[in-house]
Every structure is written in C-alpha cells, then in structure tokens.
C-alpha cells in the first residue's frame, strides 16, 4: 500500500470527510480525469487538480495534528507527478504564485501573450510543426 | 498571420506593455517554457499559464475597449490549446473555479483524493500501468 | 549544525555481503531524502542510491539494483544501504549524503550536506 | 546514456579565468538542475554551485554557474584563480527517472 493512503484516511477523520453524503451532487475530479484519456489532456487536468491541493494544504499548514500527512501526502504528489524533479516543481510553484491583480504581473503577461500563444498548439517547438501549421492553416481556409 | 497577434498587439497598447522596461527582472512565462521540452511536461505548465491569462481577461470582461481583441484571443485559446474540444474547455473552467476555501469543496476534495493519486503517474490508466506499478513497488519492497 | 556520519565499512570477501549505516542529525529527518554516493579510490563520484524522507521510495543505479538494498528508519534519524554479492568494483568510499525535502517547495539545495564518508574494501 | 561529459583536465594561472563545462549526452540540460562540487585531495565533495546558478553561502562570487541550451551544457566559471581553487570538480544532475548522475570530474591544476 502506497504511504499516502494511510495519511489520506487521516486528513479524512479531520475533514470529516468520510461519509457517504459528501459524495452527493457528484465529484469535483474524478468525474473529469474520468473523461481523459491521453496524457497531454490528463496532464492539462491534473495541473489544475494538483495546484488545489496545494493551495489547500497551504491553508492548513500550521495545524499540527495533519502536518505530518500534509508532509507525506504533498512528497508522494512530488514523486509521482513532478518525477521528484524540483525544477519541474519550481517552475509550477512559480507559475501557480503569480497575482492576476499585479499591474506588473499583467503587463509582462501581456506583453509575452503572442510568444505564449505561438508555442501552444501541440507539437509546436517540435519537427512536427510545419505539418501541425499546415492543418491550422486548412481548418481556418474554411471558415 | 494568426488573428490573435493583432489583437494582442491593442492589449500590449491598453495595458501600456509594448516598452521594453517590461521585460526588466525576467520573463513570467516563455522562460519556463523554454525549460520543457516534452509534451506532457509543457502541458502541466501551460495549463497553469492559460487559466492565469482566463483569469486576467475575466477581470477585464466589461471594459468595452477591448472586448473584441479578448473574445479573438479567448476564441483562438480554445482553437490551439483545448483543439476547439468545448468538453474539455468546461471541464478545465469547472477545476479552476473550485473555491478552497468552500467546506464542501475541501471535504470533496479529501474524499477523492486517494483516487486522485493513484492516477498521478504518468501511465496510471494506460496498458503501462502494471509496468509502472511493479516499478513503484519494486521501489518500496524491501519495507 | 547538520551532520551525517556514516559507519559500518570494513573488508569483506568476494560474495560477501555488508550493511553500512548513516546516522543523521540537526535536521527534520524524516523529512529528507538521502542518497548514497560512492568514490572507488582515485576515480570519479558514482550514485548508488536514493530513498525519499516519509514515503520510503527506493531508487537505484541500474547497475547496482537487484545487489543493493537501502532503507530508513525515522524514529531512530537513520539510513541504511545493505549490499550483498560484494565485487572488487564495490570497494569504495560510501558517502551518505543529505536530499530535497520535497514536501517544502523552498528546500535547501540537494546533495548540499555530506558525510564524511565510510570505507568499504572487497579483497580475498 | 545519459552521461554528462567534462574535460579530464584544465590548468591556468592565478588571477585569470577558466570555464569548466559540462556536456549533457541525452536529455535537455534545461529540464533538469545542475549542481556542481569541489572536492579537494582527500577532502568530502563540496557544492559551491546549486540549482544551476546559485552560490550557497561562503562561496565567493569568483565561482558562478549558468546553462547554456544551444550546446545542451552547463558550465562553471571561476574567475581571480586562486591557489586553494586547485581541486576536482564534479557537475551533477538528473536522468530521466530522475536518478543522480555525475560528470566524470574536472581536475583544475593552477600553474
């Protein structure tokens, strides 16, 4: 059994959330990863997911009877989504700490915006770009 | 050219962003994105990258000036980055809108979330999945 | 002050097998990663194995796995890398040095705390 | 593989400048940190570069670290060459499992 398992039993006593009706009115992931198939798409999913726990851990990082769960629960995450890669870490941290409501958070944002926009189709920095530009080009011809 | 460059360009002037005095201190984005290579790997950042630019533009809906230059970029968001995939648009929108600190949410959110790690490794889903599961434990057999 | 002090060397047999320890200490331990390095005499910086501070995962050089076995003990702040079917190519200096904490996206530097080493001597 | 490849062997004189680089065989350099160590004869390694350019504390800002993505390397440059800066130097990253891997180490001989 993974480590994480246990801790999760134990953020469950302390967030009461156990019982059967918190699963009422559906679920807030699980119905989604259901519906992702292809890793690119999972990971699009799981970036969100993953950036919440750690929001919510963060919230409840000075409470001392889950800390050592919190701890486990947020390493196995590093291990099995960042690949124990810090730098992968970091740069998701970095991203995930930006204030949309920084006047020169929104500038820089904007001012990166065409190269941002430029690099997200799939495949885009790779050799499989001129056919990928190709098919945007035939998609638009139509319209 | 793309319709978004001409439409980014009227944001770079609304929000004063065209100077080079904005690229002072470093990038936000496109030196992150320099880093990853492999798909999945910039997915898990691009992800966090198009919910910040979602998040801006929403604080930004009513101002009339640049309406149509956010709708162009948000359209052409949804082409390149969700492959025009309304579905998986919606359900990016339903991850990022989930409020931490809603009790409901956090209880939800601790309900699945031994279901949730069990699928963060990459292949977790796939035909991989025994390889990966043998190797994990193989990891941790000699506890 | 952070220390890692490395015990348990010696000479051993061709096919023999050895247990070296690290005990740790000035530190959240358990929090931790620790890998194992080694220095053959003269030669380069060779990593051996790692384990992860709570959840224990193993993980190891390809060509060592399948010989080489490392574990922890938190409560006692204490690491240890079980070898078995010895070579002269193990004969080295094994360094148990201090990880990431990965549960603190601000973690001091990896491989920044290293022990003074243990000197382990496979000869018939 | 993913071997990070150095040179055996570097030698200069005191007060000039050496670049000791560090040549990743597979994988992106980017992708991954890199460290780099001073260990001098008989001496526990040292890291004086972390996380691809930062300097811990008490390592003079002679001795810096950066990364270069055309030519998939990393480098140190140490500059003022000191005597006490006759020693091996070793750069570490990662492979793809993320496993620690090391170059084959740089002696720096000052003349």
């Known amino acids: 059994q993974d480590p994480y398992v246990k801790e999760a039993e134990n953020l469950k006593k302390y967030f009461n959330a156990g019982h059967s009706d918190v699963a009422d009115n559906g679920t807030l992931f699980l119905g989604i990863l259901k519906n992702w198939k292809e890793e690119s798409d999972r990971k699009i999913m799981q970036s969100q997911i993953v950036s919440f726990y750690f929001k919510l851990f963060k919230n409840f990082k000075d409470d001392q009877s889950i800390q050592k769960s919190v701890e486990t629960i947020k390493e196995d995450m590093n291990v099995k989504f960042f690949n124990s890669n810090k730098k992968k870490r970091d740069d998701f941290e970095k991203l995930t700490n930006y204030s949309v409501t920084d006047l020169n958070v929104q500038r820089k944002a904007i001012h990166e915006l065409i190269q941002v926009m430029a690099e997200l189709s799939p495949a885009a920095k790779t050799g499989k770009r001129k056919r990928s530009q190709m098919l945007f080009r035939g998609r638009r011809a139509s319209q | 050219q793309d319709p978004y460059v001409k439409e980014a360009e009227n944001l770079k002037k609304y929000f004063n962003a065209g100077h080079s005095d904005v690229a002072d201190n470093g990038t936000l984005f496109l030196g992150i994105l320099k880093n990853w290579k492999e798909e999945s790997d910039r997915k898990i950042m691009q992800s966090q990258i198009v919910s910040f630019y979602f998040k801006l533009f929403k604080n930004f809906k009513d101002d009339q000036s640049i309406q149509k230059s956010v709708e162009t970029i948000k359209e052409d968001m949804n082409v390149k980055f969700f492959n025009s995939n309304k579905k998986k648009r919606d359900d990016f929108e339903k991850l990022t809108n989930y409020s931490v600190t809603d009790l409901n949410v956090q209880r939800k959110a601790i309900h699945e979330l031994i279901q949730v790690m069990a699928e963060l490794s990459p292949a977790a889903k796939t035909g991989k999945r025994k390889r990966s599961q043998m190797l994990f434990r193989g990891r941790r057999a000699s506890q | 002050e952070v220390q890692l002090v490395e015990s348990g060397g010696g000479l051993v047999k061709p096919g023999d097998s050895l247990t070296v320890s690290c005990v740790a200490s000035?530190?959240?331990?358990?929090?931790?990663?620790i890998h194992w390095v080694r220095q053959a005499p003269g030669k380069g910086l060779e990593w051996v194995a790692t384990?992860?501070?709570?959840?224990?995962?193993?993980f190891y050089s390809d060509s060592l796995r399948g010989r080489f076995t490392v574990s922890r003990d938190n409560a006692n702040n204490s690491v240890y890398l079980h070898m078995s079917s010895l070579r002269g190519e193990d004969t080295a200096l094994y360094y148990c040095?201090?990880?990431?904490?990965?549960?603190?996206?601000?973690?001091?530097?990896?491989?920044?705390?290293w022990g003074r080493g243990t000197l382990v001597t496979v000869s018939s | 593989n993913f071997m990070l490849t150095q040179p055996h062997s570097v030698s200069e004189s005191p007060g000039k400048t050496i670049t000791i680089s560090c040549t990743r065989g597979?994988?992106?350099?980017?992708?991954?940190?890199v460290q780099w160590y001073q260990q001098r004869p008989g001496g526990v390694p040292k890291i004086v570069v972390f996380?691809?350019?930062?300097?811990p504390s008490g390592v003079p800002d002679r001795i810096s670290g950066s990364i270069d993505t055309s030519t998939n390397s990393a480098s140190l440059t140490i500059s003022g060459l000191q005597t006490e800066d006759e020693a091996d130097y070793y750069c570490?990253?990662?492979?793809?499992?993320?496993?620690?891997?090391f170059g084959g180490g740089t002696k720096l001989t000052v003349l």
């Open positions: 040095v201090r990880g990431y904490d990965h549960s603190d996206s601000n973690s001091a530097a990896d491989l920044l705390h």
């Open positions: 000035g530190f959240t331990f358990s929090n931790y990663f």
């Open positions: 384990i992860s501070g709570r959840t224990k995962y193993m």
């Open positions: 597979r994988g992106y350099i980017a992708s991954y940190y």
């Open positions: 996380e691809d350019t930062q300097r």
């Open positions: 570490q990253s990662y492979d793809d499992a993320n496993h620690v891997i």
